[in-house]
């Protein structure tokens, strides 16, 4: 056959679907790699062709749309499934095409199983609720187009294996589920079962996301250096090895760029000539707050080396910070035989 | 002083992935810093593409977030640039560029790159 | 994201003459702005960052100033070597976002 543009396998589009439940799959040719939808590409006289791998097969074989009571069949650019199988999962490939022109992907699709309490292999989307912070709503996702506006679904929350129902801060409403106000107790896995009615017969949309309750930005505050801090010195003797922690508390913020730094002398310290190696831990609370943590150490501290500012920077979204550490040499205890002796007239 | 430069094939076909890497000389790649990539179409101005901080921990951008990757490699002082399912659009001169916190400090001169059958 | 908005697209100006470049923030980003130029066939070159501090080796007749949401770059008397296209960028929040630039072409 002729040439045909062939996009391959878009493995970033892993798409995942339950056993026994409707699944409608888009054409990702118009979402990500064409520049014009179906609709043009229909009325430009293009055809769009769907065909299959099975699992552990290579050989590409036409999709049956010939199943009883139509289990997979296609609309415009969307394959559907009702019900999916569980023998399903493969590669599929859409091809658009006429007699000069031809554009294929193809991507995976995985049926999975779930249990009685929801659980599977299913990658989980994460919606962030900030604590206490009044009235926050998640939605059922990926339900639009599965009925019409006409067709009134029946909805059912879970939180994890437990049905939704005189719950104290959680109150189903329909596709929503709103939280009165979010607390730590109310992170975890939440499902929404969607029945609706179709040519006689019913079907379950089930959808599954984790919620993870996070510092709210009423209460987001620059960060705060906890070390260095005025009551620690560091007193070295040269030859000896200094290490200051820098240890910065950081407010949770969406999509904030928290960042902390040394300089010395106000110089990165890979702008100076001195041998100082710098060692970073980070650690999250239970709200994603960030404590990060930099060490900065110099193996064999030189006087000179104790003359110089030490100074952490740090920076969040909300704003910034530096403190200096309180750095300096250790006068040598003095020896009783000399300096002492001296003291008392001794010649 | 700090030099960073950029190499990979001038021309990708669409549909296949644009592998690009940075060298850095005069200074190690493993500091506490973030490398990143810019990318800049003909005639157009500057597009963030993606950084990667010395842990490894990488930051993209939303736009091109399905199909790019970005990895550090300490022990050749490089990090690189993989972008998939190029096409037309995806034409650009790319840069790479050191950031240590106070914007992109230091550019490789960069390299075009054109997507086209 | 954070969308950043350059004026005018393009500003004629005579050599000796000063230049007025504006950044607009679509929410606030503190001082955290950058400054580039960039001359044809040449990555760009850092100029100003922290909202007003000049990288090293910048000349004095570049500076920057604003906070919050609104940015300035002033070139107090341009030379030849001026002429090029300007861009700010916020680094602020992920993702990074540059402005659409800004031509600085000779009068």
């Known amino acids: 056959s002729e040439r045909c543009d062939d996009w391959g396998l878009d493995t970033m589009r892993q798409i995942q679907v339950f056993e026994d439940e409707p699944a409608r799959i888009k054409c990702p040719l118009f979402e990500h790699f064409l520049k014009f939808n179906y609709s043009t590409a229909h009325s430009a006289g293009l055809t769009l062709i769907w065909y299959w791998t099975r699992q552990d097969r290579d050989l590409e074989e036409p999709i049956n749309f010939r199943l009883p009571e139509n289990r997979i069949s296609k609309e415009k650019d969307v394959l559907w499934f009702r019900p999916t199988l569980l023998n399903d999962t493969g590669n599929y490939t859409c091809m658009l095409r006429n007699t000069t022109y031809c554009s294929k992907v193809a991507f995976p699709l995985e049926v999975v199983q779930k249990d009685s309490c929801f659980n599977s292999p299913m990658k989980l989307p994460v919606h962030k609720l900030y604590i206490e912070y009044g009235i926050q709503r998640i939605t059922c996702p990926n339900v639009d187009g599965y009925f019409p506006s006409s067709v009134k679904p029946t909805i059912t929350w879970y939180m994890g294996c437990y049905k939704i129902q005189n719950f104290n801060n959680v109150i189903p409403e329909g596709m929503n589920l709103s939280f009165l106000i979010a607390l730590i107790s109310n992170n975890g896995n939440y499902t929404c079962v969607v029945t609706y009615p179709e040519n006689g017969r019913t079907f379950h949309l089930t959808r599954t996301l984790t919620v993870k309750v996070v510092g709210s930005p009423k209460n987001a505050v620059p960060p705060v250096i906890h070390s260095p801090n005025d009551h620690v010195v560091y007193e070295k003797e040269p030859g000896e090895e200094l290490l200051i922690p820098c240890t910065v508390y950081f407010s949770f913020l969406m999509d904030s760029r928290n960042e902390v730094w040394w300089t010395i002398d106000g110089k990165k310290p890979d702008d100076i000539t001195i041998d100082v190696t710098i060692n970073e831990s980070i650690s999250h609370s239970r709200t994603e707050d960030e404590t990060r943590t930099q060490i900065l150490s110099i193996k064999k501290v030189t006087s000179e080396d104790l003359k110089r500012s030490y100074v952490c920077h740090a920076r969040s979204a909300k704003g910034e910070v530096a403190k200096a550490a309180k750095v300096k040499q250790k006068v040598p205890a003095p020896r009783y035989t000399v300096e002492l002796a001296c003291g008392f007239g001794a010649t | 002083q700090v030099q960073l430069q950029e190499s990979g094939p001038g021309l990708v076909k669409p549909s296949e992935t644009l592998s690009l890497t940075c060298a850095v000389s005069g200074y190690s790649a493993s500091g506490v810093y973030y490398w990143g990539w810019i990318r800049q179409p003909p005639g157009k101005g500057l597009e963030w593409i993606g950084n990667i901080y010395h842990s490894g921990s990488t930051y993209y951008n939303p736009s091109l977030e399905r199909r790019v990757s970005i990895s550090l490699d300490t022990s050749k002082n490089h990090f690189s640039l993989r972008l998939n399912f190029v096409t037309a659009a995806d034409t650009a001169v790319y840069y790479c560029?050191?950031?240590?916190?106070?914007?992109?400090?230091?550019w490789g001169q960069g390299t075009m790159v054109t997507v086209s059958s | 994201e954070i969308v950043m908005t350059q004026s005018p697209a393009t500003l004629s100006v005579s050599p000796g003459e000063r230049a007025t470049l504006s950044c607009r923030a679509s929410?606030?980003?503190?001082?955290?702005l950058a400054w580039y130029q960039q001359k044809p066939g040449q990555a760009p070159r850092l100029l100003i960052y922290?909202?007003?501090t000049r990288a090293t080796g910048i000349p004095a007749r570049f500076s920057g100033s604003g906070s919050g949401t609104e940015f300035t770059l002033t070139i107090s008397s341009l030379q030849s070597e001026d002429f090029a296209v300007y861009y700010c960028?916020?680094?602020?929040?992920?993702?990074?976002?540059f402005g659409g630039g800004t031509k600085v072409e000779i009068k």
């Open positions: 929410q606030s980003i503190n001082n955290i």
């Open positions: 960028q916020q680094y602020n929040n992920w993702p990074l976002t």
């Open positions: 922290g909202a007003s």
């Open positions: 560029a050191r950031d240590r916190f106070d914007a992109f400090d230091i």
